[in-house]
């Protein structure tokens, strides 16, 4: 003879892959204390329990190890404990109370199990900014997992000196000291659930911070073509009356900040131009000399200086022979 | 007998309160999870709340959650429903009923009408 | 939400003829459940865990389906039968019952 309960609340319910969920179950408060027996979670349709608290019985390969009878008859508690579930899981349960000394059992109503895609992704956390040449501790975590799957595999991606650090359950540290070039690479970290078989992963790119390394200044030269300086130049000749565009640019993150000066300027020089650009429309005796590109950033700066030498035309000069 | 029989219901103007109790006999009360049903004049039936044995569950309608609240009474084999903010959509027959998958009971109802 | 929409909303039949009515879900559900309805009184249980019929209902009636897509049959209509039969899902929150179809007898 069969007595029948309720499991209560929604008759379904929803797991992502690799994750954990507790199917609820209530035993009846009808249940006499006297009642001796164990507890079975079947399959739908199956004889042989996906969990079961009595020692002598077999429970399925395929469930064995994930499904766990939560079983406390006194508080009444007959829930269903499953871990890294997989696809294969999606199906209909029921639990049933089974005594081999009293005549009559009791079963409950079904409860499906729905198995989605894992839809959660890793969260990469890094404490204020990448600082070139200065370690920093990013941490991929999976806040979402439960404590009682089987830990994933952590696995980190990136063309930056790393080192790995500490690691939980849900988390992993990876020690990173990024250098100016690993700016806007691509970091990843990869977690395996091997309990499901499913991975996930999240990229996302570096935003180094760095002094300039590089000033170069590009020379626009009435309509000639354009040519650059990369390193301190001592006499660039020009001719009297010419249009000269000097334009200044650095590499760093966040971008330094340009001004041009005449002469080999001081910490606290006034700048004749406040940006990379420096125009000048008529080149003459007074422009004759050193203009000086700096390229200004918190963590350090750059410049880069170029000699203006002013070719004369011949009927242009006065007091002339 | 009736297992479930609601009571409490009556002709209540709009933004009042009303109680609703469903008395349980015949069977062991503290073994089932009780939902409210309505269904109002001419429509179809329309869930409101549930609430499980041991009251450690309760789940309502978006229509009426933050207005209606359901509890019960073990030891009283009694459910209620306090209903507050009512609104002229409310009106309807009120039925407690246990939806079990082989026991399933509903109240003969009680008629709540919020009226001007 | 899951919403359950019923069709016909009402039909008429005459006795011995079947009679087929249908649920669909917005979204798939678990399990359909069917309740039966007379005018002036409570709904019953007709149908439980999609296919199951409620003790006490007649074997002429069957049910079937899955996902989103269920239906209710009366292989032979009789007289008793009409009544407004109402589909319900709790396969998530909020708990949803169909707008019912009404049976008719000719």
């Known amino acids: 003879q069969e007595r029948r309960f309720q499991l209560e609340g929604p008759e379904s319910l929803t797991v992502q892959e690799g994750l954990c969920v507790l199917v609820p179950c209530r035993l009846p408060t009808t249940l006499p204390a006297s009642y001796y027996g164990y507890g079975y979670w079947f399959l739908e349709g199956a004889d042989v329990p996906v969990a079961t608290n009595d020692p002598d019985e077999e429970v399925q390969e395929e469930t064995r190890g994930r499904f766990h009878l939560l079983w406390d008859p006194r508080r009444k508690n007959c829930s269903l404990s499953i871990r890294d579930a997989r696809r294969r899981d999606n199906a209909a349960y029921f639990f049933r109370l089974k005594s081999k000394w009293m005549k009559y059992g009791y079963t409950s109503s079904k409860l499906s199990v729905r198995v989605m895609a894992l839809t959660h992704r890793p969260n990469i956390s890094i404490p204020g900014t990448l600082e070139s040449g200065h370690p920093s501790n990013l941490t991929c975590s999976v806040p979402w997992v439960c404590e009682q799957g089987t830990p994933p595999i952590f696995s980190w991606m990136s063309a930056a000196p790393t080192s790995l650090g500490p690691r939980t359950t849900q988390s992993s540290v990876l020690t990173i000291t990024p250098r100016p070039q690993d700016h806007s690479t691509n970091l990843t970290c990869q977690v395996t659930f091997p309990g499901a078989g499913v991975t996930m992963e999240r990229t996302i790119q570096l935003n180094v911070s760095y002094a300039p390394q590089k000033v170069a200044i590009s020379i626009f030269q009435g309509n000639s073509a354009a040519f650059k300086i990369l390193q301190n130049t001592s006499s660039l000749p020009v001719l009297e009356g010419q249009a000269l565009r000097l334009l200044c640019d650095a590499d760093g993150n966040p971008p330094a900040h340009l001004s041009w000066f005449q002469g080999f300027p001081a910490l606290n020089a006034t700048p004749i131009s406040n940006t990379g650009v420096l125009e000048l429309p008529q080149v003459g005796s007074a422009e004759e000399g050193d203009f000086t590109c700096r390229a200004q950033h918190p963590l350090g700066s750059l410049q880069i200086s170029l000699s203006l030498f002013v070719h004369w035309k011949p009927e242009g000069r006065a007091g002339g022979v | 007998e009736v297992p479930l029989v609601e009571s409490g219901g009556g002709l209540v103007k709009p933004g009042g309160s009303l109680k609703l109790s469903c008395a349980a006999s015949g069977f062991t009360f503290s073994d089932y999870g009780i939902h409210w049903v309505r269904q109002a004049p001419e429509k179809g039936l329309e869930w409101v709340a549930y609430?499980?044995?041991?009251?450690?569950?309760?789940y309502y309608a978006d229509t009426v959650k933050g207005r209606f609240t359901i509890s019960r009474d073990n030891a009283k084999n009694t459910l209620f429903l306090q209903m507050t903010s009512l609104r002229s959509e409310d009106t309807a027959m009120y039925y407690c009923a246990i939806l079990d998958w082989y026991f399933d009971v509903w109240g003969t109802g009680t008629t709540v009408t919020v009226s001007s | 939400q899951i919403v359950l929409t019923q069709s016909p909303a009402i039909m008429s039949a005459s006795p011995g003829e079947k009679v087929t009515m249908t649920c669909s879900a917005n979204s798939s559900v678990s399990f359909m459940h069917w309740f039966q309805q007379k005018s002036g009184t409570s709904p019953k249980r007709w149908i439980y865990?999609?296919?199951k019929l409620a003790s006490g209902v007649p074997a002429r009636f069957s049910a079937s389906g899955s996902g989103t897509s269920y239906s209710l049959t009366i292989s032979s209509m009789e007289a008793e039968d009409a009544a407004t039969y109402y589909c319900?899902?709790?396969?998530?929150?909020?708990?949803?019952f169909g707008a019912g179809t009404k049976v008719e007898l000719k």
């Open positions: 609430i499980t044995s041991v009251s450690s569950t309760i």
């Open positions: 865990d999609t296919s």
């Open positions: 319900q899902q709790w396969s998530s929150n909020p708990l949803t």
